[in-house]
């Protein structure tokens, strides 16, 4: 009978082993080993027994021992089993954004690495364990899927191996992956909310503010404005979850006509976007036109409106015939037409809204002077030593001027307060004189004495 | 469909005048700012002139600037480019374009009318 | 006047992606609008805005935007595609109303 000894080892790549070859029989004919490593035999041995040490061990292995005694031959093996770490885990690159909600697929190869039935991989979110796994197959590729939430964002996943040789060696040997950080991103279905003027004018200014909530995170979604090709800077103030752009936008007339303003969120591989139309218009004022500005009375004038092509006009509330852009109407100028006022009001519809542009023109009537009774009397008769405003109103454009004189020389004082005396009395020439040329008109004033009362 | 259609195009010696049209159809025109494009055989696009829908503003070139006149006739859906004092360098295919606004890109060309300034 | 500088001709392999670029001031304030010309044609718009495409253009043509460079893209070249290629965009300088490149020369080989 032979023995081996140790019957059993478990040893690193590349190390090395005593064994002892034994004959049952004290004086053996021949005792050996059979192996294709390099062996040495180490002396001195015994009669019936051979030391062997066997280096250089790079995979599992059965050595031989043989014995040949008289009673016959007989051989024993030792079981060599070769252990070392894996060579290689990795873990395959993960998404560079992972959308929340949606299963993440964990993948790790593992080259290498022996005795495979105490090989053990795990896929870890930090130092959690998510799945754990025999290593089958070189590489041995072990997967999972884990879903995903926006706690995940930033952590980190890794893969570990565990060759466990406690129940031979007491050694538990770990190999751990390069770390990979996932980072999840949440864009809602719905698309941003626009708010931007319908319509704006040329040569104004408007304001567009592009928000959209349940956003994570926040801080790395992107927001591009933009009204036809032309790039807006928007001021983002961010919330918890939510994202405001605004953007001041001045059109000049290059932007005249239909336009497309668009709102983008980018956020992780995804985009939402938001499309609104804006009408930019151009609407002078309309032209208000008299004949001439300044007329003398009795001179007709025509009055006309003219406005944007697309306009409907009123002139002084009165709307064209037919509806459009122009409106115009004649009239005798008289004294009471001096600072009237024609306002013309435009109308344009722009996109379904109405707009209004107003300008008015003021007509000067050139009149007089003129004196009438009215304003004017020709005869005052006051008690003596009352008090009394001598009143004349000059009427005229430009306004005249107005004065009174008895015998040439005494004026009358007109608008003011006086005391009635006897010198008052009298036939007094009232005088009005503008650049149109001067009226006269007498003022006759009696002064009753304290005897007739 | 969107339509545009060039026409006078042909020889005129150097000084001299034309009067280039672009019949439109399919697009409300009025809505629409025009613009005239042209091409100098074998070479790139240079842009030359453009109007607004309301036909209240205009723009041109240096190039052709006091020499070149754009106007449209919206009731006839029709643009137009007064061109005189034309020199060799004016000869060219003569495209008109349409867009959403003043300054926009075109987003309908004509098939182009050739003039061509020689002695 | 601005500039919009391209260059003179690129050519790719049928099938393959090519990128021709646009550069010029401009580009940073607006967005470049695309036009493909065939011999003896009238231009084509093919991208305006960010990345946008007239109805009836294929999506292998596609446009982005950095900095003071736009850049159109045909994923999936076809013999159809061999054109002059033109970028345009306003004129920020204000001297004109919008200013085109010189062209690119697109050959599809194979």
């Known amino acids: 009978q032979t023995s081996v000894f140790p019957p059993e080892v478990i040893l690193p790549r590349g190390g090395s082993v005593k064994v002892n070859c034994s004959a049952s029989c004290d004086q053996p004919i021949s005792l050996g080993m059979e192996t294709p490593l390099p062996k040495k035999e180490i002396l001195p041995g015994g009669n019936n027994w051979k030391m062997y040490e066997l280096s250089n061990v790079q995979e599992d292995s059965q050595p031989m021992c043989y014995s040949n005694c008289p009673d016959g031959q007989s051989s024993a093996k030792t079981l060599l089993t070769v252990y070392w770490t894996p060579e290689r885990v990795e873990l395959a690159p993960l998404p560079p954004w992972q959308p929340v909600g949606k299963n993440l697929t964990l993948r790790c190869q593992v080259e290498g690495g022996a005795p495979r039935a105490n090989l053990t991989v795990m896929l870890l979110r930090g130092e959690k364990e998510l799945s754990r796994q025999s290593a089958v197959g070189e590489p041995a590729e072990v997967t999972t899927t884990v879903p995903v939430g926006r706690d995940d964002h930033g952590a980190n996943f890794s893969c570990r191996t565990e060759l466990d040789l406690r129940p031979y060696v007491l050694k538990l040997f770990e190999n751990t992956s390069a770390p990979h950080q996932l980072q999840t991103f949440d864009l809602p279905a719905t698309p941003p909310q626009l708010v931007s003027p319908q319509v704006l004018e040329v040569d104004t200014q408007g304001t567009v503010v592009c928000s959209l909530d349940g956003l994570f995170p926040v801080s790395e979604a992107q927001v591009s404005l933009a009204l036809g090709d032309q790039k807006l800077n928007p001021t983002i103030t961010y919330g918890n979850n939510s994202l405001s752009a605004k953007a001041s936008v001045k059109v000049t007339a290059e932007e005249e006509g239909t336009q497309q303003l668009l709102c983008g969120v980018m956020l992780g591989n995804q985009t939402q976007e938001t499309r609104q139309t804006v009408t930019i218009y151009s609407f002078p004022a309309p032209n208000v036109n008299l004949t001439k500005p300044e007329v003398s009375e009795g001179t007709e004038v025509i009055v006309e409106c003219e406005a944007h092509p697309r306009a409907k006009v009123m002139l002084n509330g009165v709307p064209a015939q037919p509806p459009g852009p122009r409106a115009q109407f004649l009239l005798k100028a008289t004294p009471e037409d001096n600072g009237r006022s024609f306002s013309c009001s435009a109308t344009l519809e722009v996109a379904g809204q109405l707009v209004h542009k107003n300008q008015t023109r003021e007509l000067r009537v050139l009149y007089g002077p003129r004196l009438d009774e009215k304003d004017c009397p020709g005869n005052w008769t006051w008690p003596e030593n009352s008090q009394q405003t001598p009143m004349c109103q000059a009427w005229g454009n430009p306004l005249p001027q107005l004065k009174c004189l008895k015998d040439g020389t005494f004026p009358l004082p007109i608008g003011q307060s006086v005391t009635v005396t006897r010198d008052l009395e009298g036939t007094y020439l009232c005088q009005a004189r503008s650049t149109r040329g001067e009226v006269t008109r007498e003022v006759t004033v009696n002064v009753l004495s304290p005897r007739y009362e | 469909q969107v339509q545009l259609q060039e026409s006078g195009g042909g020889l005129v010696q150097p000084g001299g005048s034309l009067r280039l049209s672009c019949a439109a159809s399919?697009?409300?025109?009025?809505?629409?700012?025009m613009s005239w494009v042209r091409q100098a055989p074998g070479k790139g696009l240079e842009w030359v002139s453009a109007?607004?829908?309301?036909?209240?503003?205009?723009y041109y070139a240096d190039s052709v600037k006091g020499r070149f006149t754009i106007s449209r006739d919206n009731s006839k859906n029709t643009l137009y480019l007064q061109m005189s004092s034309l020199r060799a360098e004016d000869t060219a295919f003569y495209y008109c374009?349409?867009?959403?606004?003043?300054?926009?890109?075109?987003?309908?060309w004509g098939h182009g009318t050739l003039v061509t300034v020689s002695s | 006047a601005s500039e919009l500088t391209q260059d003179p001709a690129v050519s790719v392999a049928l099938g393959q992606t090519v990128k021709i670029t646009c550069q010029g001031d401009?580009?940073?304030?607006?967005?470049a609008s695309w036009y493909q010309q065939r011999p003896g044609q009238a231009p084509v718009l093919v991208i305006y805005?960010?990345?946008s495409r007239p109805s009836g253009i294929p999506d292998r043509f596609s446009g982005s935007s950095s900095g003071n460079t736009a850049s159109l893209t045909i994923t999936g070249a076809q013999a159809e595609d061999e054109a002059d290629y033109y970028c345009?965009?306003?004129?920020?300088?204000?001297?004109?109303?919008?200013?085109f490149g010189g062209g690119t020369k697109l050959t599809v080989l194979g």
């Open positions: 399919g697009f409300t025109f009025s809505s629409y700012a």
């Open positions: 345009n965009s306003r004129d920020s300088s204000g001297n004109h109303l919008r200013v």
């Open positions: 805005g960010e990345n």
């Open positions: 401009s580009l940073r304030t607006y967005y």
């Open positions: 109007i607004s829908g309301s036909g209240g503003s205009t």
């Open positions: 374009a349409n867009s959403a606004y003043t300054g926009g890109w075109y987003d309908y």
